[in-house]
């Protein structure tokens, strides 16, 4: 637990350089995010495809979208889960990280030093061992997060099922209802190709209890969609006299010494034959 309450930000005196004062784990081991670059990668043939079960959420059901002052978060049902890890990991929430309109490079994980525009995290907890996500969050093997790298490109109707509700959660503490949809549509092509490593929450309290799966392939959202994400939200309450835009809500990459990231794919990216005669 933090020493002095839970005030933390991505900028200013309570920014990430200060997190470890109140949240010691943030200065500790196995910290995330990291840069994924060739000299730390090792192919692991045992990394089989994950199965995404219960991801197709019925539109007849309502799911709570919340501005928590740090990101926009969608609550997920406990019967949605990942199959293919050592335990069953049940979903609890998804949220995003992004940059700002002048520098739209706000992913948390980087690939060969390069940021993507944004990043989606789908957070799961070990429901074989623990009753809920908060209990699991500081336990060994407690959490598993799927990370989707997001680049600017064509309009993405699936992501718009979240983005179209942002105007109702403009300020911290505001909540809206979102109709269920197929969360698997938020994942990229070829989900069998991913990076895997042991790391931490990327926000305080930075518990080093996360099994990370970062998908190799990005998804695309349009420039307009990205701009909506970068401009719609505030970190502050509606009545705050000093409103702060919710931008640049990503943590810098962390040191990753003497460890490896395992890949489910061998590293040569196969080129397509498009344009060749």
């Amino acid at each position: 637990a933090p020493v002095n309450g839970s005030k933390w930000t991505y900028f200013g005196p309570d920014g990430e350089n200060s997190w470890s004062k109140k949240y010691p784990s943030c200065g500790g081991l196995l910290q995330s995010p990291i840069d994924l670059h060739s000299d730390i990668l090792q192919y692991d043939a045992s990394l089989t495809p994950l199965e995404f079960q219960g991801y197709n959420l019925s539109a007849n059901k309502q799911f709570l979208l919340t501005n928590n002052g740090h990101s926009v978060k969608l609550n997920l049902p406990s019967d949605m889960h990942i199959q293919g890890l050592q335990s069953r990991y049940s979903a609890t929430q998804l949220h995003l990280h992004w940059g700002n309109p002048n520098d739209p490079h706000g992913s948390e994980h980087t690939v060969s030093g390069q940021h993507f525009a944004a990043e989606l995290h789908i957070v799961h907890y070990n429901s074989d061992l623990y009753p809920d996500a908060s209990t699991a969050s500081n336990k060994s093997e407690g959490l598993a997060v799927l990370a989707v790298l997001i680049e600017m490109g064509s309009f993405n109707p699936s992501y718009d099922k979240i983005f179209s509700h942002l105007q109702h959660v403009k300020y911290k503490g505001q909540e809206a209802f979102v109709p269920g949809f197929n969360i698997e549509e938020l994942l990229p092509e070829r989900t069998a190709e991913y990076y895997r490593y042991r790391g931490s929450l990327t926000t305080p309290p930075c518990n080093p209890t996360v099994l990370w799966t970062v998908f190799r392939n990005p998804v695309q959202i349009s420039q307009e969609q990205l701009l909506a994400l970068e401009t719609a939200l505030y970190c502050t309450h509606m009545d705050d006299p000093s409103p702060r835009e919710m931008i640049n809500n990503f943590r810098q990459v962390q040191k990753f010494d003497e460890r490896l990231v395992y890949t489910s794919f061998s590293q040569v990216q196969v080129c397509t034959a498009a344009g060749l005669s």
């Epitope: 309502q62 049902p77 406990s78 019967d79 109702h168 209802f177």
Partner: antibody, heavy 121, light 106 residues
Amino acid sequence: EVQLVESGGGLVQPGGSLRLSCAASGYSYTDYNIYWVRQAPGKGLEWVGYIDPANGDTTYNQKFKGRATISVDKSKNTAYLQMNSLRAEDTAVYYCSRPIYYGAYWYFDVWGQGTLVTVSS
Amino acid sequence: DIQMTQSPSSLSASVGDRVTITCRASSPVTYMHWYQQKPGKAPKPWIYATSSLAPGVPSRFSGSGSGTDFTLTISSLQPEDFATYYCQQWSSNPLTFGQGTKVEIK
């Protein structure tokens, strides 16, 4: 025919608790959330909370958090509302209802008949 | 919370009259829904998604509006229309209802 039937209402002492039931029939029970909505005498409608019968996940109106607990027994197709520390202003008809999605949002297409809870000494 | 203010709170009208009920939300909402309730009975769905009539609702009813201002209109009031009408929004948590408009016989 799709039906919701509430029961369990009656006279409760201030400080006491109530447990209401909402039995569903005529549809696939786990396909829709069950909402509890109450109406004080001569007043408007007020949402208390809802449950997803498929998994027991609940969401509450902040006003009732900590005082209301919604649960479900899937084998009986029945949802329950437990409310503690009752006061006179909790006197109301309590309804359960089912929302249906029609293509852009939901509306409550089915309501129970309601059950009256009177909090009085 | 989004407050929903209906006006008028009550109105007296004669059969054949045109009646308009308004509902104003304290913040913009995507859609407005309307329910009809008669004494001692549960509410019934009446208009959903601002302008779509629920099954069995006569075509003399209509709904319109956007943002914060919405209306329910009865083009020619009939005896069975005397009831209380509630608006409701589902855009923000908590979902909220208006306080109701009671339509009485003059």
